[in-house]
């Protein structure tokens, strides 16, 4: 069994203010069991953007049906983008446990925000 990889295909994504940003992420294996979380930034100060397991994230929707048993696509869409959303977003796989522990991170996708077209 190949070790799980977290694939964030795009190094960068550019979106106009007010639009939605799609950040792609797929994993290459169903093992180990555990949730996906999205963060902006890295390190201890990183900001949680989406947690597959729990929480309320009104601007974030999953692109595919993440509840599907064999789902490997954890891409997200963030609505109504503003300049404050700029940064590098990481898709992170966690291993199920008490508590869940970080298993592997994607390479990151840098989101840049263009001025709203006039």
């Amino acid at each position: 069994e190949e070790e799980l990889q977290v694939i964030q295909p795009d190094k960068s994504v550019s979106v106009a203010a007010g639009e939605s940003a799609i950040l792609h992420c797929t994993v290459t294996s169903l093992i180990p069991v555990g949730p996906i979380q999205w963060f902006r930034g890295a390190g201890p100060a990183r900001e949680l953007i989406y947690n597959q397991k729990e929480g309320h994230f009104p601007r974030v929707t999953t692109v595919s049906e993440s509840t599907k048993r064999e789902n490997m696509d954890f891409s997200i869409s963030i609505s109504n983008i503003t300049p404050a959303d700029a940064g590098t977003y990481y898709c992170v796989k966690f291993r199920k446990g008490s508590p869940d522990t970080e298993f592997k991170s994607g390479a990151g996708t840098e989101l840049s925000v263009r001025a709203k077209p006039s």
Partner: antibody
């Protein structure tokens, strides 16, 4: 064994239409994104179109957008490419390919079928 | 766009590296085509993964914006065109191809 078998291509005139099909076996077709890639004579590989596992999302290269339509029938393990308003520059070998996990990666390819657009 | 050398050469039994760089991709794949019009064969997908039917002399690695296909113990039958492929849709998926000549 994974097998992807494209239908016979053919010779058509500019402006005409042609439909290609690809029959898949040896894997769970309904779970796989599928792709058409082409290669013009003496040229490199060019991505044409990709369709999602359920068939509800399709992606197209700018060069074929509005003229080509990708579709699939999961009950028949078949992939299709409807090519309309064909141009001389569409002359190529068309390969059916199975996408792996992320759709720009391909793990299996068909043998290809030649489409010639000529007056 | 993905950039790769137009051609490289290697001695029989030697080692050769083919690079692919540029574009907006975090990940890369490698495909081999032995003659024009023949079906491509996947050598590497997602940087390092090798299909089970591919010999272990083919390996892939990615560092930053550059992916490298390494062939160790080059065989005569490795003479072919090698295409890199990117993970970002904006990259046009494929590089222009590198022709490997075995000396």
């Amino acid at each position: 064994d994974v097998q992807l078998v494209e239908s016979e291509g053919g010779v058509v005139r500019p402006g005409e239409s042609l439909r290609l099909s690809c029959e898949a076996s040896g894997f769970t077709f309904r779970n796989s994104y599928m792709t058409w890639v082409r290669q013009a004579p003496g040229e490199g590989l060019e991505w044409v179109s990709t369709i999602s596992d359920t068939g509800d999302t399709a992606y197209y290269a700018d060069s074929v957008k509005g003229r080509f339509t990708i579709s699939r029938d999961n009950s028949k393990n078949s992939l299709y490419l409807q090519m309309n308003s064909l141009r001389a520059e569409d002359t190529a070998i068309y390969y059916c390919a199975k996408s792996w996990i992320w759709w720009t990666f391909f793990d299996y390819w068909g043998l290809g079928t030649l489409v010639t657009v000529s007056s | 766009a993905l950039t790769q050398p137009a051609s490289v050469s290697a001695n029989l039994g030697g080692t050769v590296e083919i690079t692919c760089s540029g574009g907006n991709s975090n990940h890369y794949g490698w495909y081999q085509q032995k003659s024009p019009g023949s079906a491509p064969v996947t050598l590497i997908y997602a940087d390092t993964n090798r299909p089970s039917n591919i010999p272990s002399r083919f390996s892939g690695s990615t560092s930053g914006s550059t992916s490298t296909l390494t062939i160790t113990g080059v065989q005569a039958e490795d003479e072919a065109v090698y295409y890199c492929g990117g993970s970002s849709t904006g990259d046009g998926i494929f590089g222009a191809g590198t022709t490997l000549t075995v000396l």
